[in-house]
């Protein structure tokens, strides 16, 4: 029979039959090792590869590029899944970016991008976005314009400042930007007037800290 | 390149008007909010005026409200300082200033204009 | 307003050897976000003022090295660790904390 092929992402793994939300290991295009991710399967469709996660603190974002390049944490937890898979995913296939939050009251909403892809190391893993809708806001809270990642050891962003020391946190800063999905967590009656929290502008505001955030991809085609 | 060019000062008899205006590039103006500041001769800063980046926000210096219109058109890439009423104290070269960072995040001026003279005599 | 007390107001200093500038404000400027709303500014002769320090510690993009800020609360220091002839002008704090933003009354560097 036929040999059955290594699933690329978390689309795959669904259109194998595997529907339900978990951890699973996917084979990215050019990358010499397997990656364990997180899919969801249960969001509009499921079948999303999640890149990022936050949702109680437990891990520190405050690190430098290597490790932004490489990714830490635990996919059954918080993580960051690496902008070197990343930029491999999404040089597989046309993606679509989701990004899913929650408030302290609450209160969740989504942002989605019909495009989605970042470029390689040396072009600063850049952000490429098109098509913005989604509840978390009418404008967009991630750069559509392109903007290149920055962490504490590697000022890329567009400001006489350093966004990523002074707001913590990898990210796509411009200057530093309408959101930070990896700044620093806040607790419940902590999380406002927050400069360096976790902060998606266009739906709670410019120092208003969230409670859980996930970012995750799927195919334009699924 | 970041660049605030100003224009409009210049010499105006005590009660009579004057409008300032601060032109910007090289940056996403809608994005950011900005300052009038002023500095009389030979002496410092003094903060005049804010507009928010959608020019929602708005705020005046005690020794400017009710006479002073700060206003901004973001498809012109422009900030304006409407001055009314104006008395010998309000003579000071007058600069425009952009916050530091984007989205009405106050952390103090990033960018200045070149300045222009406004002398308020009789 | 919060008044802003700089000194000293002239500083005549040797090329080569360090300068400090004391910034104190009436009322504490750190805010419950754990940062201290206080920036520095150059003003060099004939010029517009220009960012060397924003909240309290951070050095602007392009600002020497040898330029830096510390403190909390109501005292602040701007240190210039050897001072160049480039670095001549008027040096002013400003609290952004509480509204309205007010200035320090200037510290003139001059050199000796």
């Known amino acids: 029979r036929e040999e059955e092929k290594p699933f690329r992402d978390c689309a795959d793994v669904y259109q194998a039959g595997f529907n339900k939300s978990g951890i699973y290991t996917i084979y990215i295009n050019n990358m010499p090792e397997p990656k364990k991710v997180f899919c969801n399967m249960d969001v509009n469709g499921g079948g999303w590869t999640v890149i990022q996660h936050r949702e109680d603190g437990s891990l520190d974002f405050q690190r430098g590029w290597k490790e932004y390049k490489m990714g830490f944490g635990n996919p059954s937890g918080e993580y960051w899944l690496g902008n070197e898979f990343i930029f491999a995913i999404t040089s597989q296939r046309q993606y679509m970016l989701r990004i899913e939050l929650m408030d302290w009251e609450g209160n969740r909403a989504y942002s989605q991008y019909d495009r989605f892809h970042i470029g390689n190391e040396k072009q600063n893993y850049r952000l490429y976005l098109k098509g913005h809708t989604g509840t978390a806001g009418k404008q967009s809270s991630l750069i559509l314009h392109g903007a290149d990642f920055s962490t504490k050891d590697a000022d890329n962003d567009n400001c006489m400042c350093k966004c990523a020391l002074m707001l913590t946190g990898g990210w796509w800063f411009d200057a530093c930007g309408p959101s930070n999905l990896n700044g620093m967590f806040y607790t419940a009656g902590q999380n406002h007037g927050k400069l360096n929290g976790i902060k998606w502008h266009y739906f709670k505001g410019p120092s208003y800290s969230l409670r859980s955030t996930t970012m995750m991809i799927r195919p334009l085609d699924f | 390149e970041v660049q605030l060019v100003q224009s409009g000062g210049g010499v105006v008899q005590p009660g009579r008007s004057l409008r300032l205006s601060c032109a910007a590039s090289?940056?996403?103006?809608?994005?950011?909010?900005m300052h009038w500041v002023r500095q009389a001769p030979g002496k410092g800063l003094e903060w005049v005026s804010y507009?928010?980046?959608?020019?929602?926000?708005?705020y005046y210096a005690d020794s400017v409200k009710g006479r002073f219109t700060i206003s901004r058109d973001n498809a012109k890439n422009s900030l304006y300082l409407q001055m009314n009423s104006l008395r010998a104290e309000d003579t000071a070269v007058y600069y425009c200033?952009?916050?530091?960072?984007?989205?009405?995040?106050?952390?103090?001026?990033?960018?200045w204009g070149q300045g222009t003279l406004v002398t308020v005599s009789s | 307003d919060i008044v802003m007390t700089q000194s000293p107001l002239s500083l005549p200093v040797t090329p080569g050897e360090p300068a400090s500038i004391s910034c104190r404000s009436i009322?504490?400027?750190?805010?419950?976000?754990?940062?201290?709303?206080l920036d520095w500014y150059l003003q060099k002769p004939g010029q517009s003022p220009q960012l060397l320090i924003y909240?309290?510690?951070n050095r602007a993009s392009g600002v020497p090295d040898r330029f830096s800020g510390s403190g909390s609360g109501t005292d602040f220091t701007l240190k210039i660790s050897r001072v160049e002839a480039e670095d001549v002008g008027v040096y002013y704090c400003?609290?952004?904390?509480?509204?309205?933003?007010?200035f320090g009354q200037g510290t003139k560097l001059e050199i000796k």
């Open positions: 200033a952009r916050d530091l960072l984007d989205y009405d995040i106050w952390t103090g001026y990033g960018y």
């Open positions: 090289g940056f996403t103006f809608s994005s950011y909010g």
């Open positions: 507009i928010s980046s959608s020019g929602s926000t708005i």
């Open positions: 009322q504490s400027l750190l805010q419950s976000n754990g940062y201290n709303y």
């Open positions: 909240l309290g510690s």
């Open positions: 400003m609290q952004g904390t509480h509204w309205p933003p007010t």
